[in-house]
């Protein structure tokens, strides 16, 4: 995994990744914790600390070396160098700068074989950004008349976000006003009296509740929105798990 905080984090994991084995059980290198290696792309703000890990085992204990863009990564290749903590199978770079961008490959080897894993580091200059919404949320849902349903909108924003849940409604049988704009109803918004604005819960739904639900998030920089559809089925029909799709882009940024 990688950290991208302003401070170097000490390796104080309770689970030790360093595995020693006896001679009778000789083995080529293998990964001991693939969960910590799942995230390959790391976009990190400039000046932060980055840590890449490749927890491995093998007998004899493998050696680890790091490559940058396929070539040997030397201390003199970056101002301030870098730290390698072999017992934690980690590479640590402090105060990253744009020139640190690239592919970082850990090469783990012993006399019985070698394995490698590549991370991609992107160093982003720090700028204010509008809200980013998690792809696929809110997700389409279906329920029977009288059922309950929940829509979730996951928001990432450095700045204070304002969340609104909006539904297209009809007035006098029309979906649009004289100005050509759709009739919209704000169902919930973040504020003093609103608990957990990222979740919209609907109880005891009727056919009238079917339709498109929009999660609209704004901060002082801009806005983002994503939507999902609610299908309300007659009582005798069981809900069908449909393929979840988003009605708008993954995220607006």
């Amino acid at each position: 995994d990688a950290i991208s905080s302003g401070d170097d984090e000490d390796d104080t994991d309770s689970s030790e990744d360093f595995v020693s084995e006896n001679r009778s059980n000789q083995r080529a290198p293998y990964w001991t914790n693939t969960e910590k290696m799942e995230k390959r792309l790391h976009a990190v703000p400039a000046a932060n600390t980055v840590k890449f890990r490749c927890p491995a085992g093998g007998n004899p204990t493998p050696t680890m070396r790091w490559l940058k863009n396929g070539k040997e990564f030397k201390q003199e290749h970056r101002i301030g160098g870098y730290k390698v903590r072999n017992q934690h199978w980690s590479l640590i770079m402090e105060s990253v700068v744009p020139s640190d961008k690239g592919n970082y490959t850990c090469l783990v080897e012993n006399e019985y074989g070698s394995i490698n894993h590549t991370y991609h580091l992107d160093v982003v200059e720090r700028s204010p950004h509008r809200p980013i919404l998690q792809a696929g949320l809110p997700a389409n849902a279906s329920t029977v008349v009288g059922g309950d349903v929940e829509f979730v909108c996951k928001v990432y924003s450095d700045a204070q976000p304002h969340i609104q849940w909006i539904k297209h409604v009809e007035k006098n049988g029309s979906k649009y006003g004289p100005d050509g704009l759709p009739y919209l109803k704000v169902l919930k918004h973040s504020g003093i009296n609103s608990s957990n604005a990222e979740v919209l819960a609907l109880f005891n739904v009727t056919e009238m509740d079917a339709g498109e639900y929009i999660c609209k998030v704004s901060n002082y920089i801009g806005q983002a929105n994503q939507s999902a559809w609610l299908t309300v089925l007659p009582k005798q029909q069981a809900p069908v798990r449909e393929k979840e799709i988003t009605a708008s882009p993954d995220y607006l940024e």
């Epitope: 700028s127 204010p128 950004h129 509008r130 450095d158 700045a159 204070q160 704004s218 901060n219 002082y220 920089i221 801009g222 806005q223 607006l252 940024e253």
Partner: antibody, heavy 114, light 107 residues
């Protein structure tokens, strides 16, 4: 590189209206709020309001509601602010600023005088 | 409206000195505070946002800290070109209010 170009200085009579512009370039105009800020020696910097060009959503400082009207022309990536019923109190430098207040126009000086 | 108070209208300092400017919000604004530098005849320039994030290209002698209601902007080693007025602003909720400004003079 984002750039905001504001219209030139204005000298107007009390009671009149004025419409100033802010032309954006170098970034996706519709993706960021456009803020308007008033500056006077007495009151300092005052936030007037903002508009989100993608859908025209506006947010105003209560103090400037009825005084300022914010609009955009997406086709020319230009934001506008109209000030109405002008008095000497409206004499100031007016800035437009991109969403995160990270890029500012050079300012438009408005003088209200008879 | 949230009131942002910069207690010092003027501060005098020397080149190489460390200087800190404070700003107090009338209510909790979490870390939603920005700092700007404005030189005579120029537009304000963003230095710090979200209380402590140094904006792209801003020299590392400029730093911001604080959360809740109390915020500090620090120049670790003042340079002659830092002569300017410095403003805080809350971007927690609309209207996004500014402090009255602190004019930094170089002795």
């Amino acid at each position: 590189q984002p750039y905001l170009q504001q219209s030139g200085a204005e000298l107007v009579r009390p009671g009149a209206s004025v419409k100033m512009s802010c032309k954006a370039s170098g970034y996706t105009f519709t993706s960021y709020n456009m803020h308007w800020v008033k500056q006077t020696p007495r009151q300092g910097l005052e936030w007037i309001g903002a508009i989100f060009p993608e859908n025209g959503d506006t947010s105003y400082n209560q103090k400037f509601k009825g005084k300022a009207t914010l609009t955009v022309d997406k086709s020319s990536s230009t934001a506008y602010m109209q000030l109405s019923s002008l008095t000497s109190e409206d004499s100031a430098v007016y800035f437009c600023a991109r969403g995160g207040f990270d890029y500012w126009g050079q300012g438009t000086t408005l003088t209200v005088s008879s | 409206d949230i009131v942002m108070t910069q207690s010092h209208k003027f501060m005098s300092t020397s080149v190489g000195d460390r200087v800190s400017i404070t700003c107090k919000a009338s209510q909790d604004v979490s870390t939603n505070v920005a700092w700007y530098q404005q030189k005579p005849g120029q537009s304000p320039k963003l230095l710090i946002f979200s209380a402590s994030y140094r904006y792209t290209g801003v020299p590392d002698r400029f730093a911001g800290s604080g959360s809740g209601t109390d915020f500090t902007f620090t120049i670790s080693s003042v340079q002659a070109e830092d002569l300017a007025v410095y403003y805080c602003q809350q971007h927690y909720s609309s209207p996004y209010t500014f402090g009255g400004g602190t004019k930094l003079d170089i002795k």
